[in-house]
Amino acid sequence: QTSVSPSKVILPRGGSVLVTCSTSCDQPKLLGIETPLPKKELLLPGNNRKVYELSNVQEDSQPMCYSNCPDGQSTAKTFLTVYWTPERVELAPLPSWQPVGKNLTLRCQVEGGAPRANLTVVLLRGEKELKREPAVGEPAEVTTTVLVRRDHHGANFSCRTELDLRPQGLELFENTSAPYQLQTFVLPATPPQLVSPRVLEVDTQGTVVCSLDGLFPVSEAQVHLALGDQRLNPTVTYGNDSFSAKASVSVTAEDEGTQRLTCAVILGNQSQETLQTVTIYSFPAPNVILTKPEVSEGTEVTVKCEAHPRAKVTLNGVPAQPLGPRAQLLLKATPEDNGRSFSCSATLEVAGQLIHKNQTRELRVLYGPRLDERDCPGNWTWPENSQQTPMCQAWGNPLPELKCLKDGTFPLPIGESVTVTRDLEGTYLCRARSTQGEVTRKVTVNVLSPRYE
């Protein structure tokens, strides 16, 4: 009778094992082991027992002990089971961003590992088991479908293999794949709302606002604002599930014409875009030209108004004849025209909008000086000791200097409240003088003495 010890062995791949072959007869003609494995016999006293070291065990094997005894030949097998953990445990790659509501298929591939009967594949979300299946096939593949929810955002999905050798007196060997972190997002089907001026004047600034509601996670949304080739630098304000991106846009003469304003929102692997056209125009204020801004009374003055070639102008409310970018009027300057405003209003149509520009110029008419009876009476008769205010107003532009002197040296206090005395009596020569010339007027002050009865 041939026996083998141990009859069953579980050992790690590439490991070694000592196998003892024994026979029941004392003098066997033959005692040995049959195996493809590298073997080394260990010398022992006696003839009925032999010990072999089998090495580099790579796969399951059944070495066989045999013996030839006088009563016949017999054999005994030992069962070597090789165990090893998988060489590859991998989740099939997936885009990290997944839209909420999508069915996401997780696929785990396992290469190698034995014994397969003891090898299980587990799919997990965090620590929660989603699916558990034995490893079948090479490579073994386990799949599960997950409906992506908002609360899955940031969750880690992984695949774990479990080689359970505890029934064989060994331990549970676990291998885990690299985790796949899921980023969930919601990008609504509605395009972003874009608020901007439809027309924008050269060398001015406009404000562009792009906004969108119903985003998740809003902080991860990227906003791209551009006017033509000019990237805008918005200030983004976030709400719970919304954002508002505000940018200042400056345009120059080079941008003149129709430009495309774009707002693109990128979240995950999706984007939404809104396009709008902005017309950039140049429209300088009309020019009001006076032949001279300052003229003397009686001078002929031409007032011209010139504007953008496509504009239509009105000068002091009167439209140009024919309607167009130029208007003019002629006048003879009078004192009443001093300080008169000449206003030119120009209107230009840009992208269906009417743009208005105004320019005003003031005419200065130099006239005078004037001293007349109404404003500078020639005769005053006042009671002695009464309080009086001598009034004499000179007119002209520029406003004349006025002085009233008696005998060329004694002043009359114009506009002052004076006590009337005999000294005040007399004839005063009032002289109004300006750059336009001078005029004089005689003013007589009579003082009435109190009558004593």
């Epitope: 002085k403 002197l405 005998d407 060329g408 040296t409 002043p411 000294d423 004839t427």
Partner: antibody, heavy 115, light 110 residues
Framework: VEESGGGLVKPGGTLTLTCTVS????????MGWVRQAPGKGLEYIGI?????RTYYASWAKGRFTISKTSTTVDLKITSPTTEDTATYFC??????????????WGPGTLVTVSS | AYDMTQTPASVEVAVGGTVTIKCQAS??????LSWYQKKPGQRPKFLIY???KLASGVPSRFEGSGSGTEFTLTISGAQSDDAATYYC????????????FGGGTEVVVK
């Protein structure tokens, strides 16, 4: 504006000082006479207006007479006393004037009253 | 009568200092007041008219103010050349030219 006629005069005599003007018309300017006795302040004697009307300090009435021609203004001193020893100035536009920034003064002429 | 009273009679000021001279009229002369500078052996120099207006060529360190009966002449940043006697003169009434000038203020610059 330039004064002349000053010098030594005996008390009780008569002295006429003359102010000669050029560059302006006396018909449109008043002229005045001011004096300053040694160690004393300025004091007005009198003024002749552009209309030839005269105005005198109360102490000068009767002893001083102002008159004018087209280019001169005279100050006649009758019966001077030693108190009248002073420098006599002729001034254009003594009070106010149409030409604000100017008051023309002569260099003055010294009158010494002594026996 | 329009009597003009000037104070102080004499004042001392250091170079660069400020001096203030007051002039009071016995009754209102409105703004009709002139200021003169008088140095020995020289004709009076016209400084200010209408109480506050600088005569032609007068430096801005001279400043006049006031109206009615109270007037002031201020010399800021006094210079040695400002040593002189200063007179105010009423330039209003023809009725009395007695005491048209103030008594004068002697300014000594040290």
């Amino acid at each position: 504006v330039e004064e002349s006629g000053g010098g030594l005069v005996k008390p009780g005599g008569t002295l006429t000082l003359t102010c000669t003007v050029s560059g302006f018309s006396l018909s449109s300017h008043a002229m005045g006479w001011v004096r300053q006795a040694p160690g004393k302040g300025l004091e007005y004697i009198g003024i002749i207006g552009s209309s030839d009307r005269t105005y005198y300090a109360s102490w000068a009435k009767g002893r001083f007479t102002i008159s004018k021609t087209s280019t001169t203004v005279d100050l006649k001193i009758t019966s001077p006393t030693t108190e009248d020893t002073a420098t006599y100035f002729c001034v254009r536009d003594p009070y106010d004037s149409y030409d604000d920034g100017y008051r023309l003064w002569g260099p003055g002429t010294l009158v010494t009253v002594s026996s | 009568a329009y009597d003009m009273t000037q104070t102080p009679a004499s004042v001392e000021v250091a170079v660069g200092g400020t001096v203030t001279i007051k002039c009071q009229a016995s009754q209102s002369i409105y703004r009709y007041l002139s200021w003169y500078q008088k140095k020995p052996g020289q004709r009076p120099k016209f400084l200010i008219y209408d109480a506050s207006k600088l005569a032609s060529g007068v430096p801005s360190r001279f400043e006049g103010s006031g109206s009615g009966t109270e007037f002031t002449l201020t010399i800021s940043g006094a210079q040695s050349d400002d040593a002189a006697t200063y007179y105010c003169q009423q330039a209003y009434s023809s009725g009395s030219i007695d005491n048209a000038f103030g008594g004068g203020t002697e300014v000594v610059v040290k």
